[in-house]
Amino acid sequence: DTEIKVNPPQDFEIVDPGYLGYLYLQWQPPLSLDNFKECTVEYELKYRNIGSETWTTIITKNLHYKDGFDLNKGIEAKIHTLLPWQCTNGSEVQSSWAEATYWISPQGIPETKVQDMDCVYYNWQYLLCSWKPGIGVLLDTNYNLFYWYEGLDRALQCVDYIKVDGQNIGCRFPYLESSDYKDFYICVNGSSETKPIRSSYFTFQLQNIVKPLPPVCLTCTQESLYEIKLKWSIPLGPIPARCFVYEIEIREDDTTLVTTTVENETYTLKITNETRQLCFVVRSKVNIYCSDDGIWSEWSDKQCWEVEELLKKTLL
């Protein structure tokens, strides 16, 4: 009985299509696969960013796989051919591993890359990123931002930079069509006459960095003698009501401060007969049903009511 063997895939490589971290892992079928024509050959692919303890493992019948990586670090991958037990009248047969690595040759020392990169997707409409220049770089250093997400056929450069003293320190993005719920890749590279500048790579999803506008139209009505209903409206813009969570800060007579989180645009507050004045502010954030993370809006304008006046309105 001859032992069944299978070769590893050929030409296994990690291909960078220029999408700032979204890479293709590609390979060719092994040599002598025609012996297994009646068989569905599979490939086990393992990959990770260098430095990561865990491998991502994929089993596929295809000759390619795509995923996002952190280009600030190197990437390593390995693949082997699998012949399922149905093909071998027994146990699964595996080839030896084929291996591939990829990294972007770093230019410049790490300190030259941008510092404190911060991106906010204002009201789920306007993306703005800002950064500080690298440590010890001269004024002749300028930084350029490029971005890509699935749906763009190539990486695009920022066209509206925020400048201070002629130096780019941020980018106002144009309208980004169909850009949420997918990885958004950014590279900030730089140039200087005096020394090479290190590039920085960032990946996030836009729905997770949304900072909504504050709620508006704050109102207050007395439902009964000791119950007050606070109401507000969702801010103008594309974010649907179901996506908000709110934080309310309530002050009674300049003393008692209550902070609470609610899921709809109303909150019923119990007061005592001692309460004379009521003030509240509200802020909003995208909730866990619409994103994994978010940024609280600014607080709304403070609204205050005299409880006596509210009671008069209720009696009328």
Epitope: E13, P17, P29
Partner: antibody, heavy 122, light 107 residues
């Protein structure tokens, strides 16, 4: 429509150099291995060189090793063949060809360009 | 290197005939053989790969068979437009070599 268009062929003296280019369109260039295949005046086909989809793997025929360099620019969808120390036996029609790939096989050529003529003569 | 030998340089046939072109490999290449057609004045065109698989859009009058070292390419009913040079090529391991070609002549 899948298309390969070669250019750069010329009449060159023995020992001279030449660069051929192949512009690809109508398919995802970075997903396919690419090759140069030449056809000699006596109509024989000879595989010259192959480069893998990402450019990491390169294969040459013994007859051109050390003299020819195959390369690709996936951003420009272009394949190149840099030829140096040219000999009269390099005279041929040079075709750019896409490497076909199926689940079980590869290294055949499923799309060919119209070719560009290289004549090496004094 | 694997040598691919097409023993017939010319085959003369008539429209409607069945014609067979053979190709022999100097060593076992499994089923890694492709067949190409080159019409005069045109570049080669893939007809068959992996010995018996027709390329996209190729009429079913063209078939291929064989494994190991002996391969054949058959046109079941020759048409006038089939006048061409036919080449076999192994796609087993580098270097990938071609046969010398067989010219199909229509009487």
């Amino acid at each position: 429509e899948v298309q390969l268009v070669e250019s750069g062929g010329d009449l060159v003296r023995p020992g001279g150099s030449l660069q051929l280019s192949c512009a690809a369109s109508g398919f995802t260039f970075s997903r396919n291995g690419m090759s140069w295949v030449r056809q000699t005046p006596d109509r024989r086909l000879e595989w010259v060189a192959t480069v893998s989809s990402g450019g990491s793997y390169i294969y040459y025929a013994d007859s051109v090793k050390g003299r020819f360099t195959i390369s690709r620019d996936n951003a420009r969808n272009t394949l190149y063949l840099q030829m140096s120390s040219l000999k009269s036996e390099d005279t041929a029609m040079y075709y750019c060809a896409r490497q076909g790939t199926t689940a079980l096989a590869t290294r055949f050529f499923d799309v060919w360009g119209a070719g560009t003529t290289v004549t090496v003569s004094s | 290197d694997i040598v691919m030998t097409q023993s017939h340089k010319f085959i003369s046939t008539s429209v409607g005939d069945r014609v067979s072109i053979t190709c022999k490999a100097s060593q076992d290449v499994g089923t890694a053989v492709a067949w190409y057609q080159q019409i005069p004045g045109q570049s080669p065109k893939l007809l068959i790969y992996s010995a018996s698989y027709r390329s996209t859009g190729i009429p079913d009058r063209f078939t291929g068979s064989g494994s190991g070292t002996d391969f054949s390419f058959i046109i079941s009913s020759v048409q006038a437009e089939d006048l061409a040079l036919y080449y076999c090529q192994h796609h087993y391991s580098a270097p990938w070599t071609f046969g010398g070609g067989t010219t199909l002549d229509i009487k």
